[in-house]
Interface confidence: low
């Protein structure tokens, strides 16, 4: 799953966590990243990258435990790293990429985290202990499970499946702004001695933000944008504003070399080597940067900055962004690419320009109405009542608003015409000497889950239409099929006639058009996140969990879904872990998520599995998982030997002894057996789940899992005095399935 520097997933936690088995695999190029937070009012577990090191913070009651990886091993190298954190029986163990990095005793109390799990970021969680935590993850979580349960299902629209190309894009790959809310944020642009910003711009946008850097003092900023097809730069410092325009047109779809240079004395913008600069009046002084350098778009705070500015700098659409691309970006002489971005929204690696939309001049004079509305409208206060000026025709007596709005009803995933009844005038237009074509609608904020489609040349780009278009069924709402049952459009309505009328109608009134979505039951589907082929080692069993297959149903929770395995039940290889030998022909989505199911291979060619999933009303089409059984191959990974003092004991750890198999995504049982007699000591295994103080027993066999958990040791029992070091040759054989490797 891809996280873009401002996204997160939330996973509820039903009960306090007594044991923790957390497994994450991530990759990122950022030295700071919040990976996971389990949150309670005070108790919490936090995993984050900080300065490229993995830090774990566990607060239980009033105690705080911190574990971290060594400073010399940086994990911000874009390579996938696997983290395993276990907290069992009062002992916490952290390992990264199979190596034990840290362990410590912890209080035995359960971790009370009723606020749930936050993956990749903390969202809007306002807890005091989150001060000073790392930024949200910008990178990939390839896998994340807690106590066997996937934390990456379901994904939200902002967290994408797979690992996005942009995270591995080198500096020579263009930043593609695909709109309409594209944005890339980079570390702050410092301009203390001087600042330079250089890039090659390709766009057809005539109005678009290019760069924004806020200053430390409230209200200070540097802003570069495309204004009426030309570059413009604004520096606001204290009470002084410097405004600069460049005369080279840039909105022609051709590449243009852009350079912005600022120092304490002057500001210069250059397009294709043609510079424009301010005189050396020294009004600029140093702008202390605050926050990130925003490229190609504006966030809410930057938009607010510009909207509040006395020069009315607000672009035509404050929340609109550049449609186009920036190549060869450098900030203060340092190359920057998508990999260095702290945050991106709707970005693409590389340059893919959209075709220019068909333009038409009929609505040209009214471009001013296409500003976007603020983030949140106070719902009941729209539109502001209009108080007509005295001396207007009697038709405007008691007039407060032009339209009576009725909700638009649309089926989920369907379409509905915007009709007269939805936007009915409150007065007789004929009597007011107004024509329907003079009542102009402008969409200032689109719906979250759908598009108002206008069958009028050029109007789609401007999002403008008239009441006559409504009557002629030229405007229809197309729903995108998502599950929310309500939505809204924000419309600014103005009248363009030159007859006497209230001035508020010339200026425009803002209306909310509620959209009511009638839900449709979607059938569930089976998806195979890693492809529909599963490989298993002969004569072994493999867990069947959401990493192998899962149900996707946008309008049913996991609790309501049931899987059926199709085909003959005799010899069916799917079983519940706790009911070995009994075929599981039907199981719940919850059982699948809990890791209760296994595929058991008992010899011969592996049997493919065909499933379907039902939500109680509709069933999915059958889906087949092809299963291939391969012969186990065993290879010694490590066999280092041990050195210990006579009479002492030494644990055998994965660093001393481990084997690798050809298992694919399968945690196979690897059994070691001692095949020869020992001369100087004995091999021992710890009982009772490896609890401190549990007894050690002599053993002739142990599993790799025991080695990983530190439950195997060699005890020197030889009482004799030797003048030289003695060597114990430990003869072992390894078994995986029915495959045996001898003379290890």
């Amino acid at each position: 799953a891809s996280f873009f520097g401002e996204n997160h997933l939330e996973v509820p936690v039903a009960t306090a966590l007594t044991d923790i088995d957390l497994q994450l695999q991530f990759s990122t190029s950022q030295p700071e990243a919040l990976l996971l937070l389990a949150a309670g009012p005070a108790d919490h577990l936090l995993l984050q990258l900080y300065s490229g090191r993995l830090q774990v913070r566990l607060v239980l009651g009033q105690e705080e435990l911190r574990l971290q990886t060594p400073a010399e091993t940086l994990l911000s190298d874009s390579i996938p790293h696997t983290v395993v954190l276990t907290v069992v029986e009062g002992w916490a163990t952290l390992s990264v990429d199979g190596f034990l990095n840290a362990s410590s005793a912890v209080p035995g109390a359960p971790l009370e985290v009723p606020y749930g799990l936050f993956v990749g970021g903390t969202g809007t969680l306002g807890l005091p202990y989150l001060r000073g935590t790392s930024r949200p993850l910008r990178g990939c979580l390839h896998a994340a499970t807690l106590n066997g349960r996937s934390l990456l299902r379901p994904l939200t629209p902002d967290v994408h499946e797979g690992c996005a190309e942009e995270f591995s894009a080198s500096d020579d790959v263009a930043l593609g702004f695909s709109g309409p809310h594209s944005l890339a944020a980079f570390p702050a642009w410092g301009t203390q001695d001087e600042g330079t910003l250089e890039f090659t711009l390709t766009t057809q946008s005539r109005q678009a933000p290019l760069a924004f850097q806020a200053g430390g003092r409230r209200g200070d900023f540097i802003y570069v944008d495309i204004f009426e097809g030309h570059l413009r730069a604004v520096v606001e410092k204290g009470q002084g504003t410097v405004l600069l325009h460049n005369s080279v047109p840039v909105a022609d779809g051709q590449p243009h070399e852009v350079s912005v240079h600022i120092n304490a004395h002057r500001l210069e913008i250059s397009v294709d080597q043609y510079p424009t600069h301010t005189s050396n009046r020294g009004v600029l002084s140093y702008l202390e940067p605050r926050g990130s350098l925003l490229l190609g778009g504006l966030d809410a705070e930057a938009s607010r900055h510009l909207q509040e500015h006395r020069l009315g700098l607000t672009p035509e659409a404050t929340n609109a962004s550049l449609l186009g691309c920036m190549e060869d970006l450098s900030v203060n002489g340092q190359r920057r690419g998508l990999r260095e971005a702290l945050l991106t929204r709707n970005m693409a690696a590389g340059c893919r320009l959209e075709e220019e939309e068909y333009e038409d001049d009929a609505y040209g004079h009214y471009e001013a109405f296409s500003t976007l509305a603020p983030e949140a409208w106070p719902a009941m206060e729209l539109p502001e009542p209009c108080v007509p000026e005295p001396g207007l025709p009697p038709v405007f007596a008691n007039f407060t608003q032009l339209l009576t709005i009725s909700p638009l009803v649309v089926a989920e995933g369907g379409t509905a015409w915007l009709e007269w009844r939805h936007v009915q005038p409150t007065l007789d237009l004929m009597e007011a000497e107004l024509r329907k074509s003079q009542v102009l609608f402008s969409v200032t904020r689109g719906a979250r889950h759908g598009e108002l489609e206008l069958d009028i040349p050029g109007a789609q780009a401007r999002k403008m239409f008239t009441l006559l278009d409504v009557v002629n069924r030229k405007a229809r709402f197309i729903h995108d099929g998502s599950e929310d049952t309500s939505d809204q459009l924000v419309l600014e309505v103005s009248v363009t006639a030159r007859v006497p009328m209230p001035s508020c109608l010339r200026r425009g009134q803002t209306y909310l058009l509620p959209i009511q979505v009638n839900p449709v039951n979607d059938p569930p589907h089976i998806i195979f996140p890693h492809g529909s082929l599963m490989v298993i080692l002969e004569h072994t069993q493999k867990p069947l969990g959401p990493e192998v297959f899962q149900a996707y149903d946008p309008d049913s929770a996991c609790e309501g879904l049931t899987f059926q395995v199709l085909g003959t039940s005799s010899g069916l290889p799917v079983e519940r872990r706790d009911q070995p030998g009994e075929p599981a022909t039907e199981f719940s989505c919850r059982e699948l998520e809990a890791g209760s199911l296994v595929y058991v291979h008992r010899g011969g060619p592996a049997q493919d599995l065909t499933f379907r999933v039902s939500d109680g009303l509709q069933a999915s089409p059958p889906a087949t998982l092809k299963v291939v059984a391969i012969r186990p191959a065993i290879q010694i990974h490590r066999s280092t030997g041990l050195r210990l003092a006579q009479g002492s004991a030494m644990p055998i750890l994965p660093a001393n002894l481990s084997v690798e198999t050809n298992a694919v995504g399968q945690d196979v049982s690897v059994l070691f057996r001692v095949t020869g007699a020992l001369q100087f000591g004995e091999l021992q295994k710890q009982g009772a789940g490896g609890v401190e103080g549990a007894e050690w027993w002599a053993t002739q066999a142990f599993h790799q899992r025991d080695v990983e958990q530190g439950r195997v040791r060699y005890l020197s029992t030889d009482p004799q005095h030797h003048a030289y070091d003695t060597v114990e040759n430990l003869a072992l054989e390894v078994q995986v399935g029915q495959e045996i490797l001898s003379n290890l």
Partner: antibody, heavy 121, light 111 residues
Framework: QVKLQQSGPELVKPGASVKISCKAS????????MNWVKQRPGQGLEWIGR????????NYNGKFKGKATLTADKSSSTAYMQVSSLTSVDSAVYFC??????????????WGQGTTVTVSS | DIELTQSPASLAVSLGQRATISCRAS??????????MHWYQQKPGQPPKLLIY???NLESGVPARFSGSGSRTDFTLTIDPVEADDAATYYC?????????FGGGTKLEIK
């Protein structure tokens, strides 16, 4: 219960150094930050810095970098602050204060009784 | 650094009346939906004692006569009704960013 016991008053000469101790009891010393705060006679409070005894991690107020050095000994649950190159402006009461983990970066919920340092020739 | 300005510098209030102390920050101390402003009480010869944390939360064991309010840059500590034992110097402190800073203090006398 939580207790922070600081070492006794110190009379030191200008240019010398002084090392103040703060012995903690009643809580997991290595898992809570320890802050140090300065108060000159009749004046307000100034934060010097903090140390996390678990791994020795420190954060300093820039004003005291090079002037104060924070250390901690987990085995004796004791935090130390050394103040060097003493001048008359270093004459003050120095407090240690535990950082409460529930409010990051830690309000100071328990304080030592203070150690008076007097710099005089 | 964030500067905290307390007013008034000293205050004399009659027993049983209300005392109000104000603290203004040079920039916002709000983050993550919280105001990182705290109030301490210090009596002569003693260390400071935490009264209010995160602008309005009463530390355990502190009487409910003490209350805190405010957000962003403007904060208030209110003691109502004042008791004789409340004679002390009160400090506001921010920890929204390092270095942690304290206000200059307000000395409360009881008439």
């Amino acid at each position: 219960q939580v207790k922070l016991q600081q070492s006794g008053p110190e009379l030191v000469k200008p240019g010398a150094s002084v090392k103040i101790s703060c012995k903690a009891s009643g809580y997991a010393f290595s898992r809570s930050w320890m802050n140090w705060v300065k108060q000159r006679p009749g004046q307000g409070l100034e934060w010097i810095g903090r140390i996390y005894p678990g791994d020795g991690d420190t954060n300093y107020n820039g004003k005291f970098k090079g002037k104060a050095t924070l250390t901690a000994d987990k085995s004796s649950s004791t935090a130390y602050m050394q103040v060097s190159s003493l001048t008359s402006v270093d004459s003050a009461v120095y407090f240690c204060a535990r950082g409460n983990t529930v409010v990051v970066p830690y309000t100071m919920d328990y304080w030592g009784q203070g150690t008076t340092v007097t710099v005089s020739s | 650094d964030i500067e905290l300005t307390q007013s008034p510098a000293s205050l004399a209030v009659s027993l049983g009346q209300r005392a109000t102390i104000s603290c203004r920050a040079s920039e916002s101390v709000d983050s993550y939906g919280n105001s990182f402003m705290h109030w301490y009480q210090q009596k002569p010869g003693q260390p400071p004692k935490l009264l209010i944390y995160l602008a309005s939360n009463l530390e355990s064991g502190v009487p409910a006569r003490f209350s805190g309010s405010g957000s962003r840059t403007d904060f208030t500590l209110t003691i109502d009704p004042v008791e004789a034992d409340d004679a002390a110097t009160y400090y506001c402190q921010q920890n929204n960013e390092d270095p942690l800073t304290f206000g200059g203090g307000t000395k409360l006398e009881i008439k």
